[in-house]
């Protein structure tokens, strides 16, 4: 069954900087990623990046930088000033679409005891929804 | 009611410009991607340009280097300037919004451009 | 570039007659595709989305299906106001592209 893995981790050198990583765990080529906080996306959750493999990537404030790191996986880097800045308990999920197979998301946060600029090593999380 | 209304059409003679705008209400016009979409008189449609939420731009070949997409979330506006103009690119321009990248939803009623002498 | 080739260019019908567009795309497009109404003097309309999913408010009568590189557009069951031209649009990749169009006319 495909998985994904979510790693949010904070930035040692900008305390309320964070970069989030996902990944895909199967065999399907990657159509969409959408990354979003606060809950799923659709879900109460507002979407900070969209990554399309042919078309590019789209994203919003706080978002700063999403890119593809391979095939499967993404990583965004969030900025970490201003009223819309993550904090410590916030929820970053990240749905990946499999063209034909379907969609899997997987939400996480920042590691209870994480010292900035270190994080839990990244382990598929709980898949909250397939469609 | 979400809406998108074109102005800026015209007559202009080949090798002219031209300047349409879109002025686009009833939805958060900066999470969108908004193109430009022409039709020749009695012809199909044929994408033009698109701008991403942060500015991105793409075009069709052919008015690449004579057309500019570019917009003002602030304004909730999409412009198209358009230089060097030619007879064939003679068309109704539309102006129409996308939720980046699930397609083309919602179209504006278009202005109509004419390029002759 | 991807073409989109659109078939048939126009056909003829009657009230009630089962109607088939198909559109080919050149190469494999997943289900980034969408249909569209158009009526003369008017703006196109969207009626189907990501291949086969019914847009808000359109008659059920309208459905989509394919994936890859072979889609159809099916009107169950033709009205009167279902006459106008129906086109194609890949938004894959950049250049987006159209089909040709389909010109349905009353028979």
């Known amino acids: 069954t495909p998985e994904v893995w979510v790693q949010v981790r904070m930035e040692a050198t900008e305390l309320s900087s964070f970069t989030i990583r996902c990944g895909f765990l199967g065999s399907g080529s990657i159509s969409l990623v959408t990354v979003s906080w606060g809950g799923p996306n659709g879900a109460g959750g507002t979407t900070l990046a969209v990554l399309h493999p042919e078309r590019g990537i789209r994203q919003w404030a706080p978002a700063r930088q999403a890119r593809w790191e391979t095939q499967s996986s993404i990583s965004l880097i969030l900025e970490g000033s201003g009223a819309s800045s993550p904090c410590a308990n916030t929820t970053f999920c990240c749905k990946f679409a499999s063209f034909p197979e379907g969609s899997w998301e997987a939400c996480g946060s920042l590691p209870p005891s994480s010292d900035p600029g270190l994080s839990a090593p990244p382990t598929p999380a709980p898949i909250l929804r397939a469609d | 009611e979400v809406q998108l209304v074109e102005s800026g059409g015209g007559l202009v003679q080949p090798g002219g410009s031209l300047r349409l705008s879109c002025a686009a209400s009833g939805f958060t016009f900066r999470n969108y991607d908004m193109h430009w979409v022409r039709q020749a008189p009695g012809k199909g449609l044929e994408w033009v340009s698109d701008i991403g939420n942060s500015g991105e731009t793409y075009y069709l070949g052919s008015v690449k280097g004579r057309f500019t997409i570019s917009r003002e979330n602030a304004k909730n506006s999409l412009y198209l300037q358009m230089n060097s103009l030619r007879a064939g690119d003679t068309a109704v321009y539309y102006c129409?919004?996308?939720?980046?990248?699930?397609?083309?939803?919602?179209w504006g009623q278009g202005t109509t451009v004419t390029v002759s002498s | 570039d991807i073409q989109m080739t659109q078939s048939p260019s126009s056909l003829s019908a009657s009230v009630g007659d089962r109607v088939t567009i198909t559109c080919r795309a050149s190469?494999?497009?997943?289900?980034?595709l969408g249909w569209y109404q158009q009526k003369p003097g008017k703006a196109p309309k969207r009626l189907i989305y990501?291949?086969?999913s019914l847009q808000s408010g359109v008659p059920s009568r309208f459905s989509g299906s394919g994936s890859g590189t072979e889609f159809t557009l099916t009107i169950s069951s033709l009205q009167p106001e279902d006459f106008a031209t129906y086109y194609c649009?890949?938004?894959?990749?950049?250049?987006?592209?159209f089909g040709g169009g389909t010109k349905v006319e009353i028979k």
């Open positions: 190469q494999g497009i997943r289900n980034d």
């Open positions: 649009l890949q938004h894959n990749s950049y250049p987006l592209t």
């Open positions: 990501a291949a086969s």
């Open positions: 129409v919004r996308e939720e980046f990248p699930l397609g083309m939803d919602v």
